[in-house]
Amino acid sequence: APTSSSTKKTQLQLEHLLLDLQMILNGINNYKNPKLTRMLTFKFYMPKKATELKHLQCLEEELKPLEEVLNLAQSKNFHLRPRDLISNINVIVLELKGSETTFMCEYADETATIVEFLNRWITFCQSIISTLT
């Protein structure tokens, strides 16, 4: 059974992930972003189901494409390099989903824009956090 300290750790990691995803969304979904129109042409795979931490496997598998889109952005739009930002997210995702269980991600039929993709995972984080608090 999860202890209160492990629940607290999970909550903090989810809050960190949430903040990172919201910061990326804020840098992209903005009228001052000169590459917004171009970025919206990229398609991302969405999870068929995302209700448990193991479903973060679906986010992990899309981190490389996410980094490629972020590389389009001007450096002044991101105070961290996309590679470092994605690396930070990857570390948190690996810790949260755990490496001992192998989960095959199932994707929805419809692909999504980067904004829809980020909003989906932001909602996921918020939903899990709300069950922990």
């Epitope: 910061m23 804020n26 903005n30 009228y31 991101f78 105070h79």
Partner: antibody, heavy 120, light 111 residues
């Protein structure tokens, strides 16, 4: 002094069109992004649309997308808002506001506004 | 869209006394460039909006130091240290971290 002056408002029937203008003076118009923001009678502020300093990008609120078009003429220091298929809910005071995307001030200068009334 | 919720919606204050307005965002407003684009605007009766504070706490030129902005992440506050008659009007928080949105406004009036 730095000034934005809107014009072109008036009373118009639903479904008709109207074009608003915003004349800028006292600053280098061509380096500023420009917004239109509206305020319905007795209500709060609602962002409508923005255009980049060079006209290269424009974005719209969902409520006006496909009906309103923002444009600018940097040689005339003028911003425009073409409003088509007007609805009763477009009734508002329309303000133009400038923003230097690099300064981080946000919308630092606003016009006095022009009133649009959509009524049959 | 980012939703900004202001409280209170009305604030009757005594001249010379302080006033405080809160603005809560549905999303973190920190941009990937490290800045937080949260502004405060003042709209006096019959006038257009006027910029008071930008990036949470920076007073715009000509704004008296009676006006102070603070906050972080999702919670922001505008304080007027000593309310004067000319401060009467509606105050809006506004974010430009994503596409611009405004709070509903807080009406400051004299008791």
């Amino acid at each position: 002094q730095v000034q934005l002056v809107e014009s072109g408002g008036g009373v118009v029937q639903p479904g008709r069109s109207l074009r608003l203008s915003c004349a800028a003076s006292g600053f280098t118009f061509s380096i500023y992004g420009m917004h239109w923001v509206r305020q319905a009678p007795g209500k709060g502020l609602e962002w409508v649309t923005v255009i980049w300093y060079d006209g290269s990008n424009e974005y719209y609120a969902d409520s006006v997308k496909g009906r309103f078009t923002i444009s600018r003429d940097n040689s005339k220091n003028t911003l425009y808002l073409q409003m088509n298929s007007l609805r009763a809910e477009d009734t508002a005071v329309y303000y133009c506001a400038r923003e230097d995307f690099d300064s981080h001030y946000g919308m630092d200068v606003w016009g006095q506004g022009t009133t649009v009334t959509v009524s049959s | 869209d980012i939703v900004l919720t202001q409280t209170p919606l009305s604030s009757p204050v005594t001249l010379g006394q302080p006033a405080s307005i809160s603005c809560r965002s549905s999303h973190h407003l920190i941009h990937s460039d490290g800045n937080t684009y949260l502004s405060w605007l003042q709209q006096r009766p019959g006038q257009p909006p006027r910029l008071l504070i930008y990036k949470i706490s920076n007073r715009f030129s000509g704004v008296p130091d009676r006006f102070t902005g603070s906050g972080t992440g999702t919670d922001f506050t505008l304080k007027i240290s000593r309310v004067e008659a000319g401060d009467v009007g509606v105050y809006y928080c506004m974010q430009t971290t994503q596409f611009p949105t405004f709070g509903q406004g807080t009406k400051v009036e004299i008791k």
